[in-house]
Interface confidence: low
């Protein structure tokens, strides 16, 4: 052997393998002839503990009591160190700090599928840190037994690499770990069981989803099995649910009909095996099968609002807009929208498929009476329509609902209320909430929002589509068989100061008096609804305070005239915005002198 | 019957890093401790770092301690010693050796061993 101790020795007493805890006494001891060249008083002999010097010791030998050695394996070394020379390796040894295994528990065997081999796992318990062998064995019928052993560090798992066979489903076997280590042996509980305790089934395979004539409602799982399963158990969920469905079932000769499903839906389908009613196990689950149900035609009815705007003496455009079926409601993909137009005295009718969109514009006379229905298609047929009459929403001034306030609601919301009209509140059968985007000239094109409230409610919050700083107008319409009634206001869900101020365009001279005109501030930099504009003025030259006037904000004005100046007087004139948070910077600044004759 | 042969030695700064390669021929590698030992010039052979069969447990000599990390891979055949922060008395022929028990740190103990290869570390 390489590196023999050729000159010493060193012993342990009373074993190179203890118990912890356990005190053991190290000798080292130089052989003849083997110590310091001269003077054998000399001799210095060292004992180290791995790198560090724990003893020493001037003669031929030196005696160590050595306690306290932590788990595992710790290193001595003996040295010689004589005058004038490097240390000089003697000899070593290990010592090993351990204890005994502990009896192993919970020893389970399993055989994977009707041709795969028994394997049994345990709990060893506390790690023995010495080197512990396992032994399994397996006793069966007819005496016949069979034996694995396992050196590995961490042995907790052996595969006899046996097969156990259906013939006799019923016959015993019986299992057993013993782990054997230098410092004593434990055994585990006997663990007793039959073939069809432990054949846990291959998961099943090749899966299948069936559907007869196209329809969610006639539906069929299929899947393979190995040939002794006897239960199965489905679990299926659609793609985007946390939560299973799960039948039992038994002899299902791997087919099964599932009645439940939604149409237009991925599911996402798993199947378990067992060979018995209640001996053995289930088997992991199969792996997934993903699948979309057939579409079924829609359900539900399209909620649709309108808006009316007048055009000329004999022509009124009406905007159409509804909202997408949610998708329970669609069951498939909506291919298109299927809009009539029927003027109702005459029997006139036009039909038209919108798709892509969910609104649609036309002009139609102002005479007559008029009514749409809409309905949603897709491949396997149509929603059933919602019809409505196209009436003046805002004519009966008697259901228009009063003290509309609109208030902030947290972030992104906006919270109206209103009172019920004077007219008999018992006739309203429902309110709509209508709001859009504020933007100066009524663009028509300005996306329109709208939720329909209970008669008995007077306030709704809105929130869909609303943005911070930017100014909604809210109209609240009672309905009432075909009539309706109005009213208005102005809202946001957040404000601030405008970041800038009108721009005056033009000062004109009328009759002693002057007309302002300015561009209104653009929307993005409104911040919130405008409550007011104010005009200042002061003389070009003077150190005085400017003059003001503060003039209402109406959406449609962008003109207000003065008559407080002086003729013959240069002025300087500027404007600014106000929000319910502040007022803006200036506007641009314009000068101008009053041309007309002084009183 | 189990032969070793080392790679990876060569010169190194002080302060630089090293991987050496145990690499063996049998089948039943995986079964045995894999023991480091290095020797420097006109010195006794010194235990460096043991890894048990299945990589699970390893112990290092103080000297090396928290600067060597033995590592194995039984689908290689191969075990590994990663050797950072070199420093100068470092410098030794370094050598890997195989045995079935794994209780083992001396040099003595073990019954296979490699040829060994040489590594450098300079100032």
């Known amino acids: 052997k390489i590196d023999a101790c050729k000159r010493g020795d060193v012993t342990v007493k009373p074993s190179h393998v203890i118990l912890l805890g356990s005190t053991v006494n190290i000798t080292c001891s130089l052989k003849p002839r083997q110590g310091c060249f001269h003077y054998s008083r000399r001799n210095k002999l060292i004992l180290y503990k791995f790198d560090r010097r724990i003893n020493f010791h001037h003669g031929h030998s030196l005696n160590s009591q050595v306690t306290g050695l932590p788990l595992g394996t710790t290193l001595f070394v003996c040295k010689l160190a004589c005058i004038n020379s490097d240390e000089i390796q003697i000899c070593g040894a290990e010592i090993f700090v351990g204890v005994a295994p502990e009896q192993p528990q919970n020893l389970s065997c399993i055989q994977k599928g009707e041709q795969g081999t028994v394997a049994c796992t345990w709990e060893r318990g506390r790690d023995t840190h010495l080197y512990t062998e396992y032994t399994l064995q397996l006793s069966g019928p007819k005496n016949l037994t069979w034996q694995k052993q396992c050196k590995d560090i961490y042995c907790d798992y052996l595969d006899f690499g046996i097969n156990l066979t259906p013939e006799s489903p019923e016959s015993n076997f019986t299992a057993k770990v013993t782990a054997v280590n230098s410092l004593g042996s434990s055994s585990s509980l006997p663990s007793t069981f039959t073939f069809l305790d432990i054949v846990r089934p291959l998961p099943p395979w090749d899966i299948r989803i069936k559907f007869q004539k196209a329809s969610v409602s006639r539906c069929t799982l299929y899947w393979r099995d190995e040939g002794l399963v006897l239960l199965n158990r489905l679990r299926y969920r659609p793609s985007n649910s946390r939560l299973w469905n799960m039948v039992n079932v038994t002899k299902a000769k791997g087919r099964h009909d599932l009645l439940d499903l939604k149409p237009f839906t991925e599911y996402e389908f798993q199947i378990s095996s067992k060979l018995h009613l209640y001996k053995g196990s289930w088997s992991d689950w199969s792996e997934s099968l993903r699948a979309q149900t057939p579409e079924e035609e829609p359900t539900g009815m399209l909620d649709v609002w309108y808006m009316k705007r007048h055009i000329d003496y004999s022509r009124q455009q009406i905007s159409l807009f509804w909202k997408n079926l949610s998708v329970s409601e669609a069951r498939g993909k909506i291919l298109h929208y299927q809009v009539t137009l029927q003027e109702l005295t005459g029997g006139k009718a036009m039909t038209q498929n919108i798709t892509g969109h969910t609104s649609w514009t036309t002009v139609i006379p102002r005479t007559g009476n008029w009514a749409v229905a809409v309905s949603a298609a897709n491949s396997k047929g149509s929603s059933l329509p919602t019809r409505i009459n196209i009436m003046n929403l805002c004519e009966a001034g008697l259901l228009a609902p009063r003290q509309v306030s609109a208030n902030s609601e947290g972030m992104d919301n906006i919270l109206v209320t209103w009172q019920p009209p004077r007219k008999d509140p018992s006739a309203v059968q429902e309110y709509v909430v209508e709001w859009r985007e504020l933007h100066p000239g009524g663009d028509t094109q300005v996306p329109l929002n709208w939720l329909r409230s209970r008669p008995y409610n007077v306030s709704a919050l809105i929130s869909e589509n609303i943005k911070s700083y930017i100014c909604y107008e809210i109209r609240v319409y009672a309905l009432s068989g075909d009539q309706g009634g109005c009213s208005s206001i102005l809202g946001n869900s957040k404000h601030k100061a405008p970041l800038s101020g009108p721009h005056i365009n033009a000062i004109t001279e009328e009759k002693g008096s002057i007309l302002i005109s300015w561009n209104s501030i653009p929307v993005q930099e409104q911040m919130g609804c405008l409550l007011h504009y104010r005009i200042y003025w002061k003389e070009r030259d003077s150190n005085s305070q400017p003059q003001l006037c503060e003039i209402p904000y109406r959406v449609s004005q962008n003109s207000h005239p003065i008559n407080s100046l002086q003729p013959r007087v240069t002025y300087v004139l500027w404007m600014t915005a106000l929000t319910a948070a502040g007022e803006s910077s200036h506007g641009n600044e314009r000068e101008f002198c009053l041309q007309g004759k002084a009183n | 019957q189990v032969q070793l042969e080392e790679s990876g030695g060569g010169l190194v700064q002080a302060g630089g890093s090293l991987r050496l390669s145990c690499a063996a021929s049998?089948?039943?590698?995986?079964?045995?401790?894999v023991g480091w030992f290095r020797q420097a010039p006109g010195k006794e052979r010194e235990f460096v770092g043991r890894?048990?069969?299945?990589?699970?447990?390893?112990y290092y000599a103080d000297s090396v301690e928290g600067r060597f990390t033995i590592s194995r891979d039984n689908a290689k055949n191969t075990v590994y010693l990663q050797m950072n922060s070199l420093k100068p008395e470092d410098t030794a022929v370094y050598y890997c050796?195989?045995?079935?028990?794994?209780?083992?740190?001396?040099?003595?103990?073990?019954?296979?061993w490699g040829q060994g290869t040489q590594v450098t570390v300079s100032s």
């Open positions: 050796a195989a045995d079935l028990k794994w209780e083992v740190l001396l040099s003595e103990h073990y019954e296979y």
């Open positions: 049998g089948r039943t590698f995986s079964s045995y401790v």
């Open positions: 890894i048990s069969w299945s990589g699970a447990r390893t």
